[in-house]
């Protein structure tokens, strides 16, 4: 049961995370005009990955897309790329994880296949989350650099008679959405990888043979306790005798090759 819960929760957390990454990528408020220590302007500037906007105090908002590829800063292009890669990997991960979900039966899919798919989707979520976090962090770093540069200009460029309002930009809402979403996707991916361990069946390809000895009724499994290396199929020295029915999760809770990823 714990495995199903972990897998399901991992899927849901990743789903929320990827939705957040998509939302952050589409949002216009990656950087917003810094209003602290600034003259009170009747316009508010903010910028996204795809367009820049100006909201006038009258309520009118006007946005202009960046209709150039070559004219954009390399860093902005890199952030765009990271976010898109994160979305694509996340979307594929979601697709794979849907089929890997334990609660969904698709034909006669083996548990080992589901385990592999769970692991694959988990890794995809982890990379997706890292891409988003990296993209947002690169943009944030770019903002901090530009902020201090424009602050320096603010105090050095006052020599002339005419003053210019220097627009400085600070962190926008999209950055926080991106960081949180990336973190959620990462956590979801880790949960999927953890769930994968519990999903994997034993490596033995043959059924257990029962020997009925007089006096005691025990099931003997050849290779049940492997010798000393500790990397066998039953490293936890599980008691073979159950004395009753097992839940679906318990049936598949033996360690496997996926334990030591």
């Amino acid at each position: 049961m714990a495995v199903t819960a972990c897998q399901g929760l991992g899927f849901v957390v990743s789903l929320i995370g990827i939705a957040g990454i998509i939302a952050a990528t589409c949002m216009d408020q990656w950087s917003t005009q810094d209003l602290y220590n600034n003259p009170v302007t009747a316009v508010f500037n903010y910028q996204g990955l795809w367009r820049s906007c100006v909201r006038e105090s009258s309520g009118f908002t006007e946005c202009r897309g960046y209709f150039t590829l070559l004219g954009l800063p390399a860093m902005l292009q890199a952030v765009r790329a990271l976010m898109i890669v994160g979305i694509v990997l996340g979307a594929i991960g979601l697709l794979v994880s849907i089929f890997a979900l334990k609660c969904i039966r698709i034909g006669s899919m083996e548990d080992s296949a589901k385990a592999n798919m769970t692991l694959t989707s988990g890794i995809m979520f982890i990379v997706s989350g890292l891409c988003a976090i990296a993209g947002v962090s690169v943009f944030a770093n770019m903002l901090v650099t530009n902020f201090w540069m424009s602050t320096a200009n603010m105090y050095t460029g006052m020599g002339g008679m005419v003053q210019t309002v220097q627009t400085r930009y600070t962190f926008g809402a999209a950055l926080f959405v991106g960081w949180v979403a990336g973190g959620l996707t990462l956590i979801g991916g880790v949960m999927m990888c953890i769930a994968c361990r519990g999903l994997a069946p034993e490596e033995t390809n043959y059924k257990a043979v029962s020997y009925h000895a007089s006096g005691h009724s025990v099931a003997y499994k050849p290779g049940g306790f492997k010798a000393s290396t500790g990397f066998g199929s039953n490293t936890k020295n599980k008691k073979i005798y159950d004395g009753g029915a097992r839940t679906e999760d318990e049936v598949q809770s033996y360690p496997s090759k996926h334990d030591y990823v």
């Epitope: 005009q33 003259p39 009170v40 302007t41 009747a42 316009v43 500037n45 903010y46 910028q47 820049s52 906007c53 100006v54 006038e56 105090s57 009258s58 309520g59 009118f60 006007e62 202009r64 005419v162 003053q163 210019t164 309002v165 627009t167």
Partner: antibody
């Protein structure tokens, strides 16, 4: 169509409060701001303040301590209150709708206010 | 506060003549976000409320005749009337619409010969 109309007393005694109401039609005060401007006889225009669609206000520096602008969205009314007026408060007071570019695109006819004892 | 200076204070013209009037601001009215200048021109005929002519320095308000043109950027702005008509006799005001508190220029009075 867009209309604005100022109303209030035409005569105010010095050191009293001047209150003017601007009743609007043809647009919503939720979406648009309203500015107040005054013009002393034979002189130029003087911007007093603005109340934006979101309810935030900005005032002229010299009058900030004595001026307040508020609105009643449901009644489509904007109120200007200027405390302890002096004789230099004698002017025609206009309210105007704020449009694109923060410009005042529609104006009321104005109300003439005389500050005198 | 931003100081708006208009020149000349009055202007005497003849019908059909081209007229230009100037407006200077003590601070730049250019917004870097959209590269627009937040300067507005108003026309006030005698006994009437002001009327919006030009917003964002060069955008003509709907219904305003094409003979009115606004230009300039940063701190220096110009209103041009390509061919003055009798109905253009009025006082013209420029206004800072960028930094609070908004401020008007002293006005340019257009008179006929």
């Amino acid at each position: 169509q867009v209309q604005l109309k100022e109303s209030g007393p035409g005569l105010v005694a010095p050191s009293q409060s001047l209150s003017i109401t601007c009743t609007v039609s043809g647009f919503s005060l939720i979406n648009y701001g309203v500015s107040w401007v005054r013009q002393p006889p034979g002189k130029g225009l003087e911007w007093l303040g603005v109340i934006r669609g979101d309810g935030n206000t900005n005032y002229q520096s010299a009058l900030r301590s004595r001026l307040s602008i508020r609105k009643d969205t449901s009644k489509s009314q904007v109120f200007l209150k200027l405390n302890s007026v002096h004789t230099d408060g004698t002017a025609t007071y206009y309210c105007a709708k704020v449009g694109r570019g923060n410009a005042m695109d529609h104006w009321g006819q104005g109300i003439s206010v005389i500050v005198s004892s | 506060d931003i100081v708006m200076t208009q020149s000349p204070s009055s202007l005497t013209v003849t019908a059909g003549e081209k007229v230009t009037m100037s407006c200077k601001s003590s601070q730049s009215l250019l917004n870097s976000g959209n590269q627009k200048n937040y300067l507005t021109w108003y026309q006030q005929r005698p006994g009437q409320p002001p009327k919006l002519l030009i917003y964002r320095a060069s955008s003509r308000e709907s219904g305003v005749p094409v003979r009115f043109t606004g230009s300039g950027s940063g701190t220096d702005f110009t209103l041009t009337i390509s061919s003055v008509q009798a109905e253009d006799l009025a006082v013209y005001y420029c206004q800072n619409d960028y930094i609070y508190p908004y401020t008007f220029g002293g006005g340019t009075k257009l008179e006929m010969n």
